[in-house]
Structures are given as C-alpha cells and as structure tokens.
C-alpha cells in the first residue's frame, strides 16, 4: 500500500530533522509516468544511503520497512518493462531534503495514477 510508504517517508523526515547528513543523492525530479517504476527503483536504492549515513537504528528499520512495502506494491503492478528511462547515475544529485520531497512526489504519482 503506497499510503504506508508515504507514512514511512514522513517518519524518516521526522527522524533526520535533528541529524546533519551531507550526502547528495541521485534524484528524479521530473518523472515521466512511463518511467515511474524505474525511477522508484532508483529512489529505493538511494534511500539505503540515508540509512547507512545516519547510523541510526530507527532510520534503518523504517527504511527497511519502506523498501519492503514499496517492492510489494511494485510487484502487485505486475512485471512492468520500461524502456528509454534514465539510469540512476544519470539523475541530478540533490540534498536529502530535496530527495525526500521528490520521493514523496513519485509515490503520490503511483497513488494518483492507480
């Protein structure tokens, strides 16, 4: 359920508020609907960087849970093959705040277009 993914993103944003994490993360800020699964997989990969950089058990657990929820939601869509989409490394690097903002935006796209 994508709304539960949103809930975990809110928890992560709450948890990192008091931390200073300098990491920049590959961020898709203008997702084409035909590339949304590819973009989501990039977001999930980059989310693990936040988990590692924070060194925080609560963040680690929330990230782990979010990834499971998101992968479950993606698999319920069936095996979607997307072509012509950007590789993660081709995306713009942004700070954590902007990354999370764009992450919420793409999850909302999955909700809105379901």
């Amino acid at each position: 359920n994508w709304v539960n993914v949103i809930s975990d993103l809110k928890k992560i944003e709450d948890l990192i508020q008091s931390m200073h994490i300098d990491a920049t993360l590959y961020t898709e800020s203008d997702v084409h609907p035909s590339c949304k699964v590819t973009a989501m997989k990039c977001f999930l990969l980059e989310l693990q960087v936040i988990s590692l950089e924070s060194g925080d058990a609560s963040i680690h657990d929330t990230v782990e849970n979010l990834i499971i929820l998101a992968n479950n939601s993606l698999s319920s869509n069936g095996n979607v093959t997307e072509s012509g989409c950007k590789e993660c490394e081709e995306l713009e690097e942004k700070n954590i705040k902007e990354f999370l903002q764009s992450f919420v935006h793409i999850v909302q796209m999955f909700i809105n277009t379901s």
């Epitope: 994508w2 709304v3 539960n4 949103i6 809930s7 809110k10 944003e13 709450d14 508020q17 800020s29 203008d30 997702v31 084409h32 609907p33 999370l100 903002q101 764009s102 919420v104 935006h105 909302q108 796209m109 909700i111 809105n112 277009t113 379901s114």
Partner: antibody, heavy 119, light 108 residues
Amino acid sequence: QVQLQESGPGLVKPSGTLSLTCAVSGGSISSSNWWSWVRQPPGKGLEWIGEIYHYGYTNYNPSLKSRVTISVDKSKNQFSLKLISVTAADTAVYYCAREGIGWPSFDYWGQGTLVTVSS
Amino acid sequence: SSELTQDPAASVALGQTVRITCQGDTLRNYYASWYQQKPGQAPILVIYGKNNRPSGIPDRFSGSSSGNTASLTITGAQAEDEADYYCNSRDSSGKNLVFGGGTKLTVL
C-alpha cells in the same frame, strides 16, 4: 513568478454547465506539478474539486466526481473545469491553484472568480 | 463530514502566542499545509511539509505535527494576522485532497 488567472461566465442557469479556464503564466503547465480547482461558497470554507497532471491524469472529489471534468491544453498553457447539472449549491468563488512538489500544498493560487447559479 | 477537523474560532492578544490545530487520522501519514485567507482574497500558503515557510512568510509562523494532529503556531501575533486559517492534506486513500473547516482568528 507563476501566476494563475481564472476566466469564464459569472452567471450560470440551474441545470446548466459551469465552464472555467485557468491560464498559467510565468511557468509551464508541463512542469512536474499537479494543477487543481478549489471552490468556496459565500461565507463558507474551501472545498477541493479535483486535480490534473499534464499527461492527462485526473482525480476528482468523490462528492463531485459524477459531474466534473478537468482537462488540460498544453499548447495554450491552461487547464479547464467543467461542472454539469449545476444548482444554487454550486454558487461559489472558484479558484485554480498549483500544487507544490512533495507533501500536500497549494503554492500558487488564482485570484478567484465568483460564479452564481441562478435563473 | 471533513476528514480534517479545526476549531471554528480562536483569539489571541496582540503580541501573544496562539496555536491553531487540525485533527485527522490521515495526518499520521501526511503532513498538513496551512493557509491564511483574508476577506475577499485568495488563500496564501504559510506552512507546508514538516515546517517549511514559503519566501515572504514571517518567521513568527511555524508548523508542527504529532500523531493525528497538526498545529500552526503564531508567535507574537500581529494585527495583520487576523484572518481565516485552513489546514489541508490528503484523505485516508491518499488520492483526494481535503481541507479543514477553517479557524477564524481574532487578534485582540
């Protein structure tokens, strides 16, 4: 600076169709944002009508869904609202607004246009 | 019935602090945003996300959330802060946007 401007008839007859257009300037309707219509009956609160993404995806308020259509015209950088079978209860100030990226918000609003439903 | 509930009215003495609240189960999943609306004018976004202010919004406005409640705090209220305040978020499905009923703030 993004600006939004609503236009359309200020008076619609009962059982008729309300049609409004929102012209977007200072930004592209083909940005990553969703675009919404919101209304406010005289002396009452705000009510969300629906939203559109430039690829044509739409979502509507369940209470209005059977009567509402929102469309987008990328060539004119505008989006439109159509509400059918109107009654006096649809009399309101109608606003168009741009949704922010990420968490729910409306970061830019039109100035609003009053539509009265009356014979 | 709205998924977001606000008290219809609040008041604050000039220069004092006031907190306006918004309640709803959906706020466990989503942050709320807050709008100020003065008579005859369009709403203006004052707070969005965890506690973000758009440029031009004074720093006396702040936002917070806990559980199913979001709050807008005005620290050192000014006469020009007298207005209606609305919260906004998504509903429990995540698909639809919803507004609270609004709080009319009077500055005494």
